[in-house]
């Protein structure tokens, strides 16, 4: 089969008239009466069709033509190319050979960006016009007026520093300073010895250098330097005025300190979020915190606080905190973190709840207050839910039982143990699943609607009777399900039995929504219409 073969990459500058030669195989010789070859360039918005000349069975040339594409937000546009023979026969292009249309000025507003373009584009910096162009598009004629990266000595004037990050660092040095700008050299060698923060040398890191655009350097020790801030200087090869850049902002040498940790205690198993307060804590480029000689997992920091997750401790007692910010090591003997024995759970009362959870559970144990935000967790029928607990002291906390309601599995009338019940207390794994508990979940109360329509008329002073089942879970012990029945927003006095809630309706008239609550269970059986006595006594 006739096909186009890969040869050298095809680069076509926009607006320049030039032929394009393609390698091929088995190109048929057009017979008399047949149309010859054409090249189709599938340029978005402006496709081009150009006559082609067959040299022989293995070579073809798209004739002199110029090409263009819309906009200046794309510097290099790969364009699909088809070769057509005799009007409609498309020659195979199995390698999907493309033509690269390009514009030298697009996205290359600075000399550095221009000279770091692909050398095959033949783009260069037209000095007089301060723009990126092909050589013959640059009006000035002297060799020095058009710079190309191929000249090893090419160097852009007017380097600029646009951004420093970070803007502060410890005097001891080690901060990796990222300098973003333009014309910051073309090769690493151009800047290797040319970066300083005031009088302090900053050593560029070759692996992080981005030609012309970014230098990352490591700041040296500034302990002996008196100044507390300084301008950053970049010299490209030498420090003559045209090749020297000064930062618009000053870099500040600071002395980070810390003076408090909160909370100051937590379980031996770790996993406690702590905040270390101080000043200049966001200085430098790198931070590491250790508690008791083990790494505290860093989360975030600002100038006044560092947050991290405590590691497990070696033994109960106080543990020193050390913060390393680059080459600065911060310590404070006054600030210690205290590891306490892990909390334990001794009892949950009552040892049951309902499907929708929400019932109050009193949890007794030891060292409960060492955990800031304990949570109770239950897993049932594949779903896992958690609820927060309120800690009273080291031995008592109150939690609301998690809901386990789901359509696929619900507890039977005699109750069922959840798959798992436990507590999330920082990193204390032993409490995640309590094997010692015989905690049960019972079905929710089943309350019937007030009437088929949901509306019930009631005479004043008549009790409201709500019928249902599972109203009193058959749980051991004295605790019972605590109901609230609201008529509108007014609670009524309740008597609860196995099959009904008897509600002494408050002295109300008119229409009121009835709401029944028990733990996380909430149901409106309908609306109550209470007539006033005066309406009832009318003839």
């Amino acid at each position: 089969c006739p096909q186009i073969l890969p040869s050298t990459q095809i680069y076509v500058p926009v607006g320049v008239v030039k032929p394009i030669t393609l390698a091929a195989r088995n190109l048929p010789q057009p017979q008399s009466g047949q149309r010859g070859y054409e090249c189709l360039f599938h340029i978005p918005g402006s496709p081009a069709r150009v006559t082609a000349l067959r040299f022989n069975s293995s070579s073809l040339q798209c004739q002199n033509s110029s090409y263009s594409y819309e906009g200046n937000d794309v510097s290099d546009l790969p364009v699909n190319l088809s070769v057509v023979w005799n009007g409609n026969f498309v020659i195979d292009n199995p390698q999907n050979i493309q033509a690269h249309l390009y514009k030298c000025p697009a996205l290359r507003e600075s000399c550095g960006l221009c000279l770091k373009a692909d050398p095959r584009f033949e783009c260069g910096w037209c000095v007089a016009e301060r723009r990126c162009s092909l050589r013959h598009h640059c009006a000035a004629d002297t060799p020095a007026s058009w710079m190309h990266a191929r000249h090893g000595s090419s160097r852009c004037t007017d380097p600029k520093i646009l951004k420093l990050s970070p803007e502060t660092g410890p005097r001891q040095g080690g901060t990796r300073l990222t300098i973003t700008g333009e014309n910051l050299g073309l090769r690493f060698e151009d800047v290797r010895l040319g970066v300083r923060v005031g009088k302090v040398l900053c050593s560029p890191v070759e692996s992080e250098y981005i030609s012309a655009e970014q230098i990352v350097c490591e700041i040296g020790d500034a302990s002996s330097v008196r100044a507390h801030d300084a301008l950053v200087e970049v010299c490209v090869r030498d420090c003559s005025p045209h090749y020297r850049a000064l930062s618009p902002k000053r870099f500040t040498f600071v002395t980070p300190t810390f003076y408090r940790v909160s909370p100051s205690r937590g379980p031996l198993s770790g996993g406690t979020w702590i905040g270390i307060e101080g000043s200049h804590l966001n200085a430098g480029s790198d931070v590491a915190v250790s508690v008791g000689g083990r790494p505290c997992s860093f989360s975030w920091r600002n100038s006044r606080e560092i947050r991290c997750l405590t590691p497990p401790g070696q033994s109960p007692g106080s543990a020193p905190i050390i913060i390393n910010i680059n080459r600065a090591q911060l310590t404070n003997p006054e600030v210690k973190y205290n590891y306490t024995e892990d909390p334990t759970i001794l009892r949950i009362d009552p040892e049951w709840s309902i499907n929708s959870g929400g019932t109050l559970l009193t949890v007794t144990g030891t060292n409960l207050a060492t955990v800031r935000e304990p949570r109770i967790r239950a897993k049932y029928g594949g779903i896992e839910r958690e609820n927060g607990c309120l800690v009273y002291n080291d031995t008592t906390m109150v939690c609301r039982a998690p809901s386990v309601a789901n359509p696929v599995r619900s507890p039977p009338e005699l109750g069922e143990r959840p798959d798992e019940l436990g507590f999330v207390m920082d990193n204390v794994r032993s409490l995640l699943v309590l094997n010692s508990t015989s905690f049960l979940y019972y079905p929710d109360p089943v309350l019937e609607p007030l009437s088929p329509t949901g509306l019930l008329e009631l005479k004043p002073s008549s009790p409201l009777i709500l019928k249902g089942r599972n109203l009193l879970p058959p749980a051991p012990g004295n605790s019972r399900l605590n109901y609230t029945v609201l008529i509108g927003s007014t609670p009524c006095t309740l008597t609860v039995s196995e099959t009904q809630l008897l509600c002494e309706a408050p002295n109300l008239t008119g229409q009121h929504k009835v709401t029944v609550r028990a733990g996380g269970f909430e149901f409106s059986p309908g609306t109550l219409q209470v007539y006033s006595d005066s309406l009832l006594t009318l003839p």
């Epitope: 929708s356 594949g382 779903i383 599995r409 929710d444 609607p449 007030l450 088929p452 949901g454 909430e522």
Partner: antibody, heavy 117, light 112 residues
Framework: SLEESGGDLVKPGASLTLTCTAS?????????IYWVRQAPGKGLEWIAC???????AYYASWAKGRFTISKTSSTTVTLQMTSLTAADTATYFC????????????WGPGTLVTVSS | QMLTQTASPVSAAVGGTVTIKCQSS????????LSWYQQKPGQPPKLLIY???TLASGVSSRFKGSGSGTQFTLTISDVQCDDAATYYC?????????????FGGGTEVVVK
């Protein structure tokens, strides 16, 4: 019986709320009410369900974020749908879950939602 | 999770037997949480079988469900003209790990 309402012809990107109403009965507290949809000529697709005894709700993974199921009274459950696309064109059914059989026992006749520009 | 049903259409002669399979990509809850539904054009689905094999009230005993875990079958014996419809299986799964439910793609039964 159950009855759906609120189906309409809407433009892509629009929002719509469907209502499921219990007729001749009110929801008991242990009911789960479901929304299921069926695109023209296609199969059934579970969207979401809600427990009348609390606000526990579950969604199909594809429906999370764009669909919201809520109970609004003792006889109604709604399905709010946002950022509708042509792919949401379907008949939407509400149904009552049978707790004892773990199946959808009672179905409404459905309401048609058409999303088209 | 996914439920794959016997491809449509399935043809049967009056008085014959039709078998529709439903395969789940993972076990359904309690190994038997699968129900079968019949749907006729312009109508909502109707529950036929729940718990894989229990006949819903008012449904003809010609419909029989079987299977467990991931493989389930609906068998219609002594097929009648009125059985022409699309049949769907619905699987229930633990709601925590994935979606609570998934329908099969449906199997159309054509009665000749």
């Amino acid at each position: 019986s159950l009855e759906e309402s609120g189906g309409d012809l809407v433009k892509p990107g629009a929002s719509l709320t469907l209502t499921c109403t219990a007729s001749g009965f009110s929801f008991s507290s242990n009911y789960w009410i479901y929304w299921v949809r069926q695109a023209p000529g296609k199969g059934l697709e579970w969207i979401a369900c809600i427990y009348i005894g609390s606000d526990s709700a579950y969604y199909a993974s594809w429906a999370k974020g764009r669909f919201t199921i809520s109970k609004t009274s003792s006889t109604t459950v709604t399905l709010q749908m946002t950022s509708l696309t042509a792919a949401d064109t379907a008949t939407y059914f509400c149904a009552r879950w049978d707790n004892s059989g773990r199946a959808l026992k009672l179905w409404g006749p459905g309401t048609l939602v058409t999303v088209s520009s | 999770q996914m439920l794959t049903q016997t491809a449509s259409p399935v043809s049967a002669a009056v008085g014959g037997t039709v078998t529709i399979k439903c395969q789940s990509s993972q076990s359904v809850a309690d190994n038997n949480h699968l129900s079968w539904y019949q749907q006729k054009p312009g109508q909502p689905p109707k529950l036929l079988i729940y718990f894989a094999s229990t006949l819903a009230s008012g449904v003809s005993s010609r419909f029989k469900g079987s299977g467990s875990g991931t493989q389930f079958t609906l068998t219609i014996s002594d097929v009648q003209c009125d059985d022409a419809a699309t049949y769907y299986c619905l699987g229930n799964y633990d709601c925590g790990s994935a979606d609570c439910h998934a329908f099969g793609g449906g199997t159309e039964v054509v009665v000749k």
